[in-house]
């Protein structure tokens, strides 16, 4: 079953390579278990950036080596991606799945264009 997912159109990463955005889904029921996946689309290639599952009201559990962190509040997921560089600029798509209880719902956002600008190196001071 399909579900609507909303996310901001554009986000600019900080000078430290950190970008945050909210992924909001219109839950048709009372989901207790949710899976969130962030995918990056660039040059028609799609790659998985990170994925997490969480029980409603609990923190998102990403893998240990994940570049993502996040928190949830109701039907909103606050996602933060770190370690970004200019080459990581692209469309970051939020995918939400309501895993339990049945029925299973799937929603895919339109994507957030994240722009990453590498900071200029500090000039050497004499």
């Amino acid at each position: 079953k399909a579900m609507h997912v909303a996310q901001p159109a554009v986000v600019l990463a900080s000078s430290r390579g950190i970008a945050s955005f909210v992924c909001e889904y219109a839950s048709p029921g009372k989901a207790t278990e949710v899976r969130v996946t962030v995918l990056r689309q660039a040059d028609s290639q799609v790659t998985e950036v990170c994925a997490a599952t969480y029980m409603m009201g609990n923190e998102l559990t990403f893998l240990d080596d994940s570049i993502c962190t996040g928190t949830s509040s109701g039907n909103q997921v606050n996602l933060t991606i770190q370690g970004l560089r200019a080459m990581d600029t692209g469309l970051y798509i939020c995918k939400v799945e309501l895993m339990y209880p049945p029925p299973y719902y799937l929603g895919i956002g339109n994507g957030t264009q994240i722009y990453v600008i590498d900071p200029e190196p500090c000039p050497d001071s004499d």
């Epitope: 995918l39 689309q41 799609v46 790659t47 998985e48 994925a51 798509i93 995918k95 799937l106």
Partner: nanobody
């Protein structure tokens, strides 16, 4: 056109095992993910398990965790569901599904294979 064909269903006693297979045909492809869903008569469709190609990462519904194992053979374009310690509540029509890319949703579905667990 991609086709998914499930097999391996049947009638089994509670506590028994079955191994479902889902073979993809119709071209050369690399799926982002493949999964299993089930639907019991009069019930809503339920997610069972899936496996993502990227890291071979698996995910299971709590109701089957520790009893079911999903695996795939990329060379054969086949995904398997090993079901152990079956319970009467596992009785359902089991569907295989595949995603071409992570942002396309479940693009392809099989016709399903029936699993009946008697007590």
């Amino acid at each position: 056109e991609v086709q998914l064909v499930e097999s391996g269903g049947g009638l089994v006693q509670a506590g028994g095992s079955l191994r479902l297979s889902c073979a993809a045909s119709g071209g050369t492809f690399s799926f982002y993910g493949m999964g299993w869903f089930r639907q019991a008569p009069g019930k809503e469709q339920e997610f069972v398990a899936d496996i993502r190609t990227s890291a071979g990462r698996t995910y299971y519904a709590d109701s089957v965790k520790g009893r079911f194992t999903i695996s795939r053979d990329n060379a054969k374009n086949t995904v398997y569901l090993q079901m152990n310690s079956l319970k009467p509540e596992d009785t359902a029509l089991y569907y295989c599904a595949a995603e071409m890319s992570g942002i396309s949703g479940w693009d392809y579905w099989g016709q399903g294979t029936q699993v009946k667990v008697s007590s």
